[in-house]
């Protein structure tokens, strides 16, 4: 089982949309795949895929999950808020026929405030 996640870095404006993609590949067929998205180590959702369908379509605040055969799991955040900023990781495990798991690399999501003055103030507040 292998998991490739992208993009590595994503910068979007508050109120827009962010799309994180996880490609899950396995050399042999699987009957049930457990998937998980985490943000800063906390679980956003942990559905499974069987018969080509996700058991859950919601993933965290304003998060929508979709599965596109043969291998693409997409997390769409819409609309994006400032507290969506963080480090996202996709994890997958084949549960049936036999347990095998893998996880992607981190996607770092940066959300810029809709009001540019907020952005200037935030940057100005950094020490040094």
């Amino acid at each position: 089982l292998s998991v490739q996640q992208g993009p590595n870095l994503l910068q979007v404006r508050q109120g827009s949309q962010a799309t994180l993609v996880c490609q899950v590949d396995q050399a042999t067929a699987w009957e049930r795949l457990r998937v998980k998205w985490t943000k800063d180590g906390a679980i956003l959702c942990q559905p499974y895929i069987t018969n080509g369908s996700l058991s859950l379509g919601v993933c965290g605040p304003q998060g929508r999950l979709s599965w596109q055969a043969p291998s693409h799991l997409t997390l769409q955040l819409d609309p994006v808020s400032l507290n969506h900023s963080g480090a996202y990781v996709c994890w997958a495990a084949v549960e049936i026929p036999e347990l095998e798991e893998a996880e992607g690399n981190i996607t770092r999501l940066f959300v810029d405030p809709d009001d540019p003055t907020q952005n200037r103030n935030r940057i100005a507040s950094f020490p040094g």
Epitope: T28, A69, P70, S71
Partner: antibody
Framework: QVQLQESGPGLVKPSQTLSLTCTVS??????????WSWIRQHPGKRLEWIGY???????SYNPSLKSRVTISRDTSKNQFSLKLSSVTAADTAVYCC????????????WGQGTMVTVSS | DIVMTQSPDSLAVSLGERATINCLSS????????????LNWYLQKPGQSPKLLIY???TRLSGVPDRFIGSGSGTDFTLTISSLQAEDVGDYYC?????????FGDGTKLEIK
């Protein structure tokens, strides 16, 4: 590009252990998502998958041979090996190593094969 | 284990003519999770290792001539060579990767008539 080369004795006595090594060049056997297999071709041309070792060191064997087979690896030498115990004449075959990836699940690179004869 | 049954055992076809090889699996090789058939086709020329032609039942490997056509789904698969060339002679094998153990068909020997 990836190249695989089998090595080992061409003649093994019955009841002994067959030992072969596959040396991989141009690619690391620890690369995520890749599987390193042994396949044999019997004199009648029948192809038989023996088993694989994956990028993390996990193995999967053909149940018909599982009690006699061990596949291991040496990442420092970029090699993986086959041991088949208690051999009989039925184990006489051309033994090939081959690689396969999660993303493209087919044997895309093969060694040229080495003939192993089991005979006293 | 999934049993792969190939037919015919051997086949003689004239140059430029169509060659058809069949492969029947003992259980379905289609997954609704991935929308894929876990079936590959290989050609083995004398003195060489097998070389992949078709994967996922119908996808030609890059560089494989378009006269090689893979079709079928579930348990019934076909490899068609639309216009036989001299270099196409050899042994053809189907192979599944639906589950372990991976198994091959017994092969079809293709010759020129």
């Amino acid at each position: 590009q990836v190249q695989l080369q089998e090595s080992g004795p061409g003649l093994v006595k019955p009841s002994q252990t067959l030992s072969l090594t596959c040396t991989v060049s141009g690619f690391s056997i620890s690369t995520s998502g890749y599987y390193w297999s042994w396949i044999r071709q019997h004199p009648g041309k029948r192809l038989e998958w023996i088993g694989y070792i994956n990028y993390g060191g996990g193995t999967s064997y053909n149940p018909s041979l599982k009690s006699r087979v061990t596949i291991s690896r040496d990442t420092s030498k970029n090699q993986f090996s086959l041991k088949l115990s208690s051999v009989t004449a039925a184990d006489t075959a051309v033994y090939c190593c081959a690689t396969m990836a999660d993303r493209f699940a087919f044997f895309d690179v093969w060694g040229q094969g080495t003939m192993v004869t089991v005979s006293s | 284990d999934i049993v792969m049954t190939q037919s015919p055992d051997s086949l003689a076809v004239s140059l430029g003519e169509r060659a058809t090889i069949n492969c029947l699996s003992s259980q379905s090789l289609f997954s609704s999770n991935t929308n894929r058939n876990y079936l590959n086709w290989y050609l083995q020329k004398p003195g060489q290792s097998p070389k992949l032609l078709i994967y996922h039942a119908s996808t030609r490997l890059s560089g494989v001539p378009d006269r090689f056509i893979g079709s079928g789904s579930g348990t019934d698969f076909t490899l068609t060579i639309s216009s036989l060339q001299a270099e196409d002679v050899g042994d053809y094998y189907c192979q599944h990767h639906y589950e372990t153990p991976l198994t091959f068909g017994d092969g079809t020997k293709l010759e020129i008539k």
